[in-house]
């Protein structure tokens, strides 16, 4: 995930309880990871901007058969107004770098923790 800093406002923000639950699930994934997450599957990195939740879902939805991230995929769909299908890239504007799912989850988790600490939620 790119653009961890350098933006003034994250745009619209979620309720704190929802953000907290998503963070808890990502923490659970990273702590329980033994073998390479999703067999080392690669996903598109995303820009951590206002549209990052839909972008994150659009990236992760293309990983199939990985039970470890299925709950995260379902949860992210609550943050996105519209249904997201595999191969859909309306929010994922820039597709230039692929990273492992494990790194994607770690980067997303770090960013969400930062938003939570800064009180960027409803």
């Amino acid at each position: 995930l790119t653009c961890l800093g350098g933006f003034a406002s994250p745009g619209p923000v979620p309720p704190s309880t929802a953000l907290r639950e998503l963070i808890e699930e990502l923490v659970n994934i990273t702590q329980n990871q033994k073998a390479p997450l999703c067999n080392g599957s690669m996903v598109w990195s995303i820009n951590l901007t206002a549209g990052m939740y839909c972008a994150a879902l659009e990236s992760l939805i293309n990983v199939s058969g990985c039970s470890a991230i299925e709950k995260t995929q379902r949860m992210l769909s609550g943050f996105c107004p519209h249904k997201v299908s595999a191969g859909q890239f309306s929010s994922l504007h820039v597709r230039d770098t692929k990273i492992e799912v494990a790194q994607f989850v770690k980067d997303l988790l770090l960013h969400l923790k930062k938003l939570f600490r800064e009180g960027q939620f409803n």
Epitope: P15, R74, M75, G78, P81
Partner: nanobody, 119 residues
């Protein structure tokens, strides 16, 4: 044109239950995340609960967790909110919105249904 029609509100005693419904039309209901919000008398709009398009992921504000249950029937284009163990502080106008956890403050909503919890 998006149309959302809430129903099921009413006067109920503390500890009682109600089931709110929201009939949706004018869009492909099963393609959208849906959210319930509420507005108490003299207060601002507050988020209550959200369900994803497939209905397999739900979120609740802390104060209603364990008491309220959001669900949807995509075949009937209907969103539900089961209210249980109601408290006086749950008194509000309840609105359904075609909105996610992010977009709920500025999304279209119906005319609402009034829930009054009083003894």
């Amino acid at each position: 044109e998006v149309q959302l029609l809430e129903s099921g509100g009413g006067l109920v005693q503390p500890g009682g239950s109600l089931r709110l419904s929201c009939a949706a039309s004018g869009f492909t209901f099963s393609d959208y995340t849906m959210t319930w919000v509420r507005q108490a008398p003299g207060k601002g709009l507050e988020w209550v609960s959200t369900v994803n398009p497939d209905g397999d992921s739900t979120f609740y504000r802390d104060s209603v967790k364990g008491r309220f249950t959001i669900s949807r029937d995509n075949a009937k284009n209907t969103l539900y909110l089961q209210l249980s163990s109601l408290k006086t502080e749950d008194t509000a106008m309840y609105y359904c919105t075609k909105a996610s956890l992010i977009t709920w403050p500025q999304s279209p909503r119906g005319q609402g249904t009034l829930v009054t919890v009083s003894s």
